[in-house]
Interface confidence: medium
């Protein structure tokens, strides 16, 4: 019996087609992805093949103005339209709190939403009961397939799930649910979830009874043969893990942003054992037409976005200096504003020991593309912010050793004075440079804001200590020559859309007046 698994992950509100790098589509003939194109390909496969499941491994939420405006209603609407069979909860599904998950998505989805390792407690338990499930048995042709879900246990550090959801260890939580499916005579089981490729592989190895793992979170691109676009494969598709009980378990992921549709064919024997597995992600490029029905609906929903982008978010009473003449040479108040917003967006998980789990921000000055003039009545709009941050990136959470941070700050000024983009703007950091010294030895003082303290203060950076830092995904991926971050980071979790982070902060503060205050000397 053959099953076709179509899968997406980390779509991050790319409902419209995008450019090849998943930013805003400029030249339509070279654009990719989007739900209208995805629908065309999915329907083509559904017509051609008998047993098809369309699955999503989480993080539909967060990433473009679509999510900012529609807050998840767009996810439910268009996933319903594409007739997804099941979805696993990702960490970003909690970005607007539990209510922001329940109302727009859990109550509106026409497909099961899954996570076995999230347990509700207190008053939330009855409110959320039945709205998401640990597993679902889906009829496919004449057979049934069990889908069991999981979500990153780091979600409380990455999003806003509140205090009434407990995120258990994935493997510990999955095993009893898989065992339950086995007792129901379900002998074909897919683990669908959002914890990253390393955890996906562990689940394949450790959870008895899981036949296939469909993952997300790490934006992993797997491919067999010559890759069709710019993404470099992290391994073959499917990636085969030998389980502790000796089975060959295929593990798949489909990069991110709806650029690819994962396509995996699994052959099962009559006892539900995987006999063979093969496939590849399908690049959703312009050779695949956009479905006109879905496209028309997208255009209808778009109208509200255009109206939103010109509305006032808040006011500034000072000039927001985002000029390259400032931000690539010295501390600029636009850099300070953005870094303050990035830290504010990550205020969560305080306890008796820690006032917050992260206090530091770094931001390449070259990523700040425009100033905002306060003389326009002080008004700040989404449109203004899109000019400052036009690349559609995210502000991510990484863990780095102090020694890596020191290298990053040396790189920041290694060719100072040439108006290059690597000059770092900061938050929760005081850095002093001596530019008379030779490149690679110019950082003379580097103090960082403590987190394990009741009164935050600046302490000298410790080379062997591990620090959490918020930074643009561009830097996490080694952009602007920050190869040491990419090579030496100990953990990387994708965060929220950059413009959304700053716009939320400005809306919260209502009036802003960021200063140049001696963070960089």
């Amino acid at each position: 019996w053959e099953l076709t698994i179509l899968h997406t992950n980390d779509v991050h509100s790319r409902l419209e087609q995008t450019s090849e790098d998943s930013s805003k589509c400029v030249n339509a003939s070279r654009c990719m992805g989007g739900v209208a194109r995805l629908f065309t390909k999915v329907q083509q496969i559904r017509r051609a093949e008998p047993n098809v499941l369309l699955l999503d491994a989480g993080d539909q939420y967060q990433g473009t103005i679509w999510f900012t405006v529609y807050k998840g209603a767009e996810v439910a609407h268009f996933m319903n339209a594409l007739r997804y069979d099941a979805m696993a909860l990702g960490n970003h599904e909690f970005d607007n709190g539990v209510e922001g998950l329940i109302e727009p998505l859990l109550k509106e989805a026409k497909f099961p939403i899954l996570s076995a390792n999230i347990k509700a407690k207190g008053p939330l338990a009855s409110q959320i009961s039945g709205l998401y499930l640990p597993y679902k048995v889906l009829p496919v042709g004449d057979e049934v397939v069990g889908i069991v879900g999981y979500t990153s246990k780091e979600t409380p550090f990455l999003s806003n799930p509140g205090t009434n959801l407990v995120f258990e260890d994935e493997i510990t939580a999955l095993q009893p649910e898989v065992d339950k499916l086995k007792t129901l005579n379900v002998n074909k089981i897919i683990a669908l979830g959002h914890s990253g490729f390393e955890t996906d592989k562990l689940i394949a190895q450790k959870v008895r009874g899981v036949d296939v793992v469909v993952g997300g979170h790490s934006n992993t691109f797997l491919y067999t043969g010559n890759p069709p676009s710019k993404e470099v494969p992290a391994g073959k598709y499917p990636f085969i893990v030998t389980s502790d009980d000796g089975r060959k378990v295929p593990v798949v992921q489909a990069y991110a942003f709806g650029k690819y549709l994962g396509y995996l064919k699994i052959e099962f024997d009559e006892r539900g054992n995987v006999i063979s597995s093969h496939g590849n992600p399908i690049l959703l490029n312009s050779s695949i037409p956009e479905d006109p029905s879905i496209k028309a609906d997208i255009n209808k929903w778009r109208i509200k976005l255009d109206n939103y982008s010109t509305q006032e978010l808040g006011k500034t009473i000072v000039y927001l200096d985002g000029s390259s003449q400032s931000c690539r040479f010295r501390e600029c108040n636009m850099g300070n504003l953005i870094c303050d917003a990035m830290i504010n967006n990550n205020l969560r998980h305080a306890d008796e020991m820690f006032w917050n789990h992260v206090s530091m921000c770094i931001l390449n000055g070259g990523g700040i593309r425009s100033p905002i003039d306060e003389r326009n009545n002080g008004t700040i709009t989404w449109e203004n912010l899109a000019a400052v941050l036009p690349f559609g990136g995210t502000f991510d959470l990484v863990q780095l050793k102090g020694s890596t941070l020191k290298k990053a700050f040396e790189h920041s000024v290694h060719r100072y004075g040439q108006s290059t983009g690597e000059f770092l703007q900061v938050g929760g950091i005081h850095v002093v440079y001596d530019l008379s010294r030779k490149p690679g030895d110019r950082v003379v003082k580097l103090d960082v804001l403590c987190t394990k303290c009741r009164v935050p203060s600046y302490d000298p950076l410790k080379m062997d200590e591990i620090y959490k830092v918020i930074l643009p995904n561009f830097l996490a991926n080694g952009g602007d020559g920050f190869q040491m971050i990419k090579d030496e980071l100990l953990r990387h979790d994708s965060g929220d859309q950059d413009i959304n982070v700053v716009s939320t902060y400005i809306s919260k503060m209502k009036v802003i007046y960021p200063a140049v205050e001696g963070r960089i000397k």
Epitope: F39, Q43, R46, N80, A81, L82, R83, D85, K110, F111, L138, P139, D291, P292, S293, I294, A296, D297
Partner: antibody
Framework: QVQLQESGPGLVKPSETLSLTCTVS????????WSWIRQPPGKGLEWIGY???????NYNPSLKSRVTISVDTSKNQFSLKLSSVTAADTAVYYC???????????????WGQGTLVTVSS | DIQMTQSPSSVSASVGDRVTITCRAS??????LAWYQQKPGKAPKLLIY???SLQSGVPSRFSGSGSGTDFTLTISSLQPEDFATYYC?????????FGGGTKVEIK
């Protein structure tokens, strides 16, 4: 191949409740929208309402106060109840699934063969 | 509710004829229109969806066109099995509504 079969009494007295069941075979009821549509003798088609396999419903406003559609996933069946019937409710009643080609329950395929319900004392 | 008006209400034609049926919506429905064929004592059968897409298994002599408020079903060369009543149906908004039907009879 999905097949639909309506069943229920062919004669209902005025002011009583008309009850019909549609049994779905060859496919799951949970993943689709399922509609009831009726056709008075010699007349056109009227959409009554739908239920999604997970339970959400949508009814024609002209009948909303009298209609209840429910689903029993364990039996792969969905049902129609129309209360306070009059002679004007005499019709062939069809159950139908949304077409697989339809992203939004826009059109109907397949249909059941229909069952004639006469309202008369 | 969106009203769907079909014309003509009946048409007499011979085998091999080209037959055109029109359907007008009381407000714009984009391409959210389907055409059905119904034979006496039988359930309707989906022919065309999304205004112009041919349902699988339907002969290519059936075609649909139009957008907005005005739509057309064309049978390019009428066959004996095509004598039936044809209905249009809008799928743009709820409640779903059907046209009054067009009966295609033998001349």
């Amino acid at each position: 191949q999905v097949q639909l079969q309506e069943s229920g009494p062919g004669l209902v007295k005025p002011s009583e409740t008309l009850s019909l069941t549609c049994t779905v075979s060859g496919g799951s009821i949970e993943r689709y929208y399922w509609s009831w549509i009726r056709q008075p003798p010699g007349k056109g088609l009227e959409w009554i309402g739908y239920i999604y396999g997970r339970g959400s419903t949508n009814y024609n406003p002209s009948l909303k106060s009298r209609v209840t559609i429910s689903v029993d996933t364990s039996k792969n069946q969905f049902s129609l109840k129309l209360s306070s019937v009059t002679a004007a409710d005499t019709a062939v009643y069809y159950c139908a699934r949304e077409s697989q080609e339809s992203p939004y329950n826009n059109w109907f395929d397949p249909w059941g063969q229909g069952t004639l319900v006469t309202v008369s004392s | 509710d969106i009203q769907m008006t079909q014309s003509p209400s009946s048409v007499s034609a011979s085998v091999g004829d080209r037959v055109t049926i029109t359907c007008r919506a009381s407000q714009g429905i984009s391409s959210w229109l389907a055409w059905y064929q119904q034979k006496p004592g039988k359930a309707p059968k989906l022919l065309i969806y999304a205004a112009s897409s041919l349902q699988s298994g339907v002969p290519s002599r059936f075609s649909g066109s139009g957008s907005g408020t005005d739509f057309t079903l064309t049978i390019s060369s009428l066959q004996p099995e095509d004598f039936a009543t044809y209905y249009c149906q809008q799928g743009n908004s709820f409640p779903r509504t059907f046209g009054g039907g067009t009966k295609v009879e033998i001349k």
